[in-house]
Interface confidence: low
């Protein structure tokens, strides 16, 4: 049968169906119909936006689409004790007071349940002491602070710059260091871009703005009372001292306006070096505490927020496939928000709408996929990615015997330069041929593809002409599909131009200014941005979903792999004596990289060859290449982080956002000189290597001929 | 036994167009991505572009040098591949391959002539 | 574009010879490299997929090897049939690129 027969197809009803009926008008009544009120998860409104995307789905065409309920555990801030932060004199009387409340933007003064700042998950506590301010509380920060200039955090208040990495990582390493509580404030060096106005007037964030956010370290667990399994009805929950990821010290964030109050007062040493210089006008002293006059003055906490068992909901919707309805394509994104939501989630939750709508456009008039398509709004991303997590749990076994691929979407937008993407190797060759066939939205490109414009703006590192694609990380709901369960992932939005805008993320990210209007007047007046992320998206799923061979190039696993070991190599080699004295070889690495580059070469000929009209062979090659990445999960997981399982990639130790190759080797060779038992150090480098030799051998051999 | 067989192949002159076929056989031809490579005489290999297949969406890829002036495209019921060649010039003259995915096989030529 | 550079440009070599010809690619192309042999007036053939997978029916005396931007095609006991232009050429990126060829001459 051709394709077309195979899935009840016209010549119509292809790609460029799918992509004509996404409309930017679409998406931009979609974005302000999800942005009206706050959609924090746990909340009434929250549940009553799940109800109407399920309704709308519905409207849509989708076979099915249903709620799934957890109760996991949230925090959220005592609406009659306010969390703040103070400075005291001797006397033990407050003289300064952060504030409240973000001043709310305009046109929203009357809109009630905006949480005001707060750090989720945070314990409750009235800690009071000297202030140590340790840049943006990096491993590395904490290196330069103990071990070079000699100061000591423990029993300290310590404040840190957002940026750079997760705030749960910045959370983590405090308490290491023995601080007794953590302020998080958002530096305009890191969150004000030069040359442009503070919201209202402008995309930047003004001295009253804060940015929200959990600090849990839960390492893919999900909810933190029910490690590893749904949190449903009949759910064994731990008890709160052994739950999961949860800080042990108080933590608030705060505006730069009141950071200002706190740092200008900091004596004790100068800053290292100028990158520990923002761009406040404070000396930037590292303390610990306050100069002369203000010697006797401390800073104290109040944090009285609480932890509660609270119901959410997913909605998942079905477009059962054609052909083969047992193997699933994933597009997922959150609902949740802190408060408003303009960008995140808000700006993805309108393209899956979009995207949703033309796919049941193309059903009512009588196509399907060849493979099955879950659609997923997800609740409590902001709290943990624990809406996505929980029905993984639930649906585990299904999923690594079904799943495809998922596609991630969060945010659509995080600035209007050009477009990101992260993704498995796998999916390389799709989203170069995929953006090779989508036009480009950017001013200079009329009539130039996406992956003109993408390429020559974001240029590869490795390979000229091509554009840059980066490992997965985490910090999104792909961690549990990827990460877990081995599911092939991708994710992709527009960015912005990173050599010009050094700030973390966008500086309205969490805050209560991340309204409809900042996107409709600063990022994406048109919703050209946010239409060709849709394509992106939609288009993945769309080939993911239809064409009769899975668009997955093994090969391009051999190239990273090569790529990485070599990297993980050259670390190493760091210590030639030590790798001598105890033996510490990569040769078992290099050979499997070796076997898995010359049998994917072979699988990918086969390929091309086999008989496509045989359904048990095509089933029987595509199975191979969707078990592939099943194939890198190691069911014991990387050490002390049993649900991150897959040994070619990992969020960083230090840095949960970002992505870690060969992240086992890598952590065992992590600041190895330091460690007390060299001997027991590099003998677990020797073991991570035998692990991840192991593994890619094992998933080369996946893709040899069955028999 | 997988055959390519180019045919069209001529003389012509600059500006003007030609329209190379190829007839395959021996293979399921729907399944596979078809491309052309051209030798001019005495020098080396140069491709051409390439046709995907129709789960691919007939997705087409051109060398810089012939982009805007030939065409490929395929009829799969007749199992033939087509490189509508335009706007032709002198150093287009080669023989002109087509050949399956990988270039694992090849026809045995056509000659095209550009000359005044 | 990748540029596949081919040396020698053309070797002299007697039956029963070995004969190594070396393929430089401009960027990393992986193993996205093939080798082709090629006698006057016919067309090409190939010999080598994925860098180092000999084709269906190519006798074994010929290895291909390498990856990243090195690739070297290796002919053992070289026979009177293996008198030839020798390509290679990369299908990891647009536009695909060949060698501009290894002429193998009896000596």
């Known amino acids: 049968k051709s394709s077309n027969e195979a899935t009840n197809i016209t010549p119509k009803h292809n790609m460029k169906a799918f992509l004509d009926e996404l409309k930017a008008e679409n998406i931009k009544k979609f974005l302000y119909n999800f942005t009206q009120i706050p959609h924090l998860a746990g909340t009434e409104q929250n549940f009553q936006l799940a109800k109407q995307i399920q309704s709308q789905w519905k409207e849509f065409g989708l076979d099915s689409v249903e709620l799934a309920h957890y109760d996991v555990l949230l925090s959220y801030p005592n609406k009659t004790h306010p969390n703040y932060i103070s400075i005291i004199n001797e006397d033990g009387n407050e003289i300064f007071n952060t504030s409240l409340f973000e001043p709310p933007p305009p046109g929203y003064e009357n809109v009630s349940d905006i949480v005001p700042p707060f750090s989720a998950f945070s314990p409750q506590g009235m800690p009071e002491g000297d202030l140590v301010y340790v840049n943006y509380a990096r491993t590395e920060d904490f290196f330069k602070l103990e071990r070079d200039m000699k100061i000591n955090c423990s029993g300290k208040i310590v404040i840190a710059r957002y940026g750079k990495v997760f705030r749960g990582n910045k959370v983590k390493n405090a308490q290491l260091a023995g601080a007794k509580g953590v302020i998080l404030y958002s530096d305009p060096a890191d969150y004000f871009a030069p040359g442009v106005k503070s919201y209202p007037d402008g995309w930047n964030l003004p001295g009253g703005g804060v940015q929200r956010g959990n600090i849990l370290n839960l390492n893919g667990a999900g909810d933190p009372l029910t490690p590893g399994y749904p949190a449903n009805e009949y759910a064994y929950r731990r008890g709160i001292a052994e739950a999961v990821g949860l800080p042990s010290i108080p933590v608030h964030p705060i505006g730069y306006y009141d950071a200002q109050k706190l740092l200008e007062k900091m004596g004790g040493s100068a800053p290292p070096d100028s990158s520990w210089r923002g761009s406040l006008k404070v000396p930037y002293n590292v303390g610990p505490g306050f100069t002369g006059n203000f010697s006797t003055q401390k800073v104290k906490m109040h944090i009285h927020s609480t932890n509660e068992v609270t119901r959410i909901y997913n909605v998942i919707g079905t477009l059962r496939g054609a052909v083969e309805p047992d193997r699933y394509v994933i597009l997922g994104g959150h609902r949740d928000s802190w408060v408003f939501g303009g960008i995140d989630p808000q700006s993805g939750a309108a393209v899956v709408h979009e995207i949703v709508r033309s796919f049941g456009t193309l059903k009512k008039e009588g196509w399907r996929p060849r493979r099955t398509i879950l659609f997923a709004s997800w609740d409590a991303e902001e709290f943990g990615l624990l809406g996505s997590t929980e029905w993984a749990e639930e649906n585990s076994r299904l999923l690594q015997e079904r799943g495809v691929a998922y596609i991630n979407a969060d945010s659509s937008i995080e600035g209007n330069y050009t477009l990101r993407v992260d993704c498995t190797p796998l999916m390389y060759s799709l989203v170069h041929n995929l953006t090779k066939e989508l036009k480009s939205p950017d001013e200079g490109f009329e009539g130039k593809s996406l992956y003109e414009s993408w390429t020559k703006k974001s240029p590869s590192p490795e390979f000229s002409g091509m554009p840059r694609i980066s490992k997965l990380g985490s910090g999104n709901d792909f961690e549990v599909f990827f990460q877990r369960l081995g599911i092939a992932s991708g994710r992709a939005r527009y960015t912005k131009n990173w050599e010009t805008n050094k700030f973390s993320g966008y500086p309205l990210y969490h805050s209560v200014y991340e309204t409809y209007e900042l996107v409709e007047k600063f990022y994406d007046p048109m919703f050209k941005y946010h239409l060709t992320v849709a394509q992106v998206r939609g288009g993945m799923v769309f080939e993911l979903a239809n064409s009769i061979v899975l668009p997955f190039d093994c090969r391009d696993y051999a190239v990273v792999l090569r790529k990485y070991a070599d990297k993980i190599y050259s670390i190493s080699m760091k210590h030639p004596q030590e790798m001598k004295t105890y033996s510490v070889s990569f040769d078992s690495l290099f050979s499997a990289v070796k076997n898995f580059t010359e049998i994917a070469s072979k699988f990918s000929e086969r390929l091309q060859d086999f008989d496509k009209s045989n359904p048990i062979v095509l089933r029987m090659m595509n199975d191979q290449l969707m078990f592939l990445e099943r194939a890198f999960i190691d069911p014991l997981g990387l050490p002390d982080r049993p649900f991150y399982r897959h040994v070619i990639y990992a969020p960083s130790s230090h840095n949960k956002y970002a992505g870690e190759s060969f992240p086992g080797i890598y952590d065992a060779l992590f600041d190895i000189e330091s460690k007390v038992d060299p001997s027991k150090a590099w003998g677990e480098v020797k073991r991570q290597i035998y692990v991840a030799a192991f593994t890619v051998q094992a998933a080369a051999e996946t893709l040899s001929e069955v028999a | 036994e997988v055959k390519l067989v180019e045919s069209g192949g001529g003389l012509v002159q600059p500006g003007g167009s030609l329209k190379l076929s190829c007839a395959a056989s021996?293979?399921?031809?729907?399944?596979?991505?078809m491309n052309w490579v051209r030798q001019a005489s005495g020098k080396g290999l140069e491709w051409v572009g390439e046709i995907r297949s129709q789960s691919n969406n007939f997705a087409t890829h051109y060398a810089e040098s012939v982009k805007g002036r030939f065409t490929i495209s395929r009829d799969d019921s007749k199992n033939t591949v087509y490189l509508q060649m335009n706007s032709l010039r002198t150093e287009d003259t080669a023989v002109y391959y087509c050949t399956r995915r990988w270039n694992n096989f090849w026809g045995q030529g056509t000659t095209v002539t550009v000359s005044s | 574009n990748i540029v596949m550079t081919q040396s020698p440009s053309s070797v002299s070599a007697s039956v029963g010879d070995r004969v190594t010809i070396t393929c430089k690619a401009s960027e990393n192309v992986g193993t996205y490299v093939s080798w082709y042999q090629q006698k006057p007036g016919t067309a090409p053939k190939l010999l080598i997929y994925?860098?180092?997978n000999r084709f269906t029916g190519v006798p074994d005396r010929f290895t291909g090897s390498g990856s990243a931007t090195d690739f070297i095609l290796t002919i053992n006991n070289l026979q009177p049939e293996d008198f030839a232009t020798y390509y290679c050429g990369q299908s990891y990126t647009f536009p695909y690129t060949f060698g501009q060829g290894t002429k193998v001459e009896i000596k």
């Open positions: 021996g293979f399921t031809f729907s399944n596979y991505w």
């Open positions: 994925g860098a180092s």
